[in-house]
Interface confidence: medium
Amino acid sequence: IPAPSIRLVPPYPSSQEDPIHIACMAPGNFPGANFTLYRGGQVVQLLQAPTDQRGVTFNLSGGSSKAPGGPFHCQYGVLGELNQSQLSDLSEPVNVSFPVPTW
């Protein structure tokens, strides 16, 4: 099943201590899906979309220096025929960068 779209949403982080907000959206015919957010190949967070919505926003607290670095991906799963779980492909990657301090 098709990959979701992924994007950063405001407010954008200005430092590593700021929270990160990442929206993940399935195509229109997959509302209520279960979403997984990965970073650096590891699962960061799991969220289920409301039954009338096709996306979620992951809110990651700042300062989690132990989290793996690298790009984020997301993926969703839906129940198909015979209640079999079907997984989408992974989204394209999205990176988080912080403005260079001016001081």
Epitope: V43, L46, G70, P71, H73, L87, L90, P93, N95
Partner: antibody, heavy 117, light 111 residues
Framework: QIQLVQSGPELKKPGETVKISCKAS????????MNWVKQAPGKGLKWMGW????????TYADDFKGRFAFSLETPASTAYLQINNLKNEDMATYFC??????????WGQGTSVTVSS | KIVLTQSPASLAVSLRQRATISCRAS??????????MHWYQQKPGQPPKLLIY???NLESGVPARFSGSGSRTDFTLTIDPVEADDAATYYC?????????FGGGTKLEIK
Amino acid sequence: QIQLVQSGPELKKPGETVKISCKASGYTFTNYGMNWVKQAPGKGLKWMGWINTYTGEPTYADDFKGRFAFSLETPASTAYLQINNLKNEDMATYFCVREHFYALDYWGQGTSVTVSS
Amino acid sequence: KIVLTQSPASLAVSLRQRATISCRASESVDSYGNSFMHWYQQKPGQPPKLLIYRASNLESGVPARFSGSGSRTDFTLTIDPVEADDAATYYCQQSNEDPRTFGGGTKLEIK
């Protein structure tokens, strides 16, 4: 198109150092991890580790801790493998490999390292 | 460390017949509904080429004659029908945990 171009073959003596380069093009370098794979003559593939091209953090397999170092020159979209204090058992072809969706999708052409006194 | 055992080590298959290669992992390579098992083809003097990623997904540009299946610890690469150009060594690889590991390889000969 996506390409990983590695530096040419190396002939070294035991105890010397070699540094292999891997220049990436055709994609955003920092979006994908870079892995290194060793293949001794006539043998199978052995994963050496990978470097997170976004943070620069390397991860080494146990057999490649100590004498081996991964590094980056991010503005030049280039990854490096350095092997110090070369030994006979380091004689092999080394591949840099892009990681995509956790599989190894684009491979460099390989760099042959010969160790001979 | 996850050990991958491929079988057979070599096989000879007639043109247009089916080739089946097995890869068994010493522990599960599944996480969160994904099977982190991949298959590669390597011809002499060339780098390996990705064929199948995450157990059953066909890499772009790879002929549909190649397919992958399996989950947890048991995986299969199938080539049907085999063509002369398929003579090569095939490797499975897991990326569920570090160290990433490869199977020992299966050499396919076309009769």
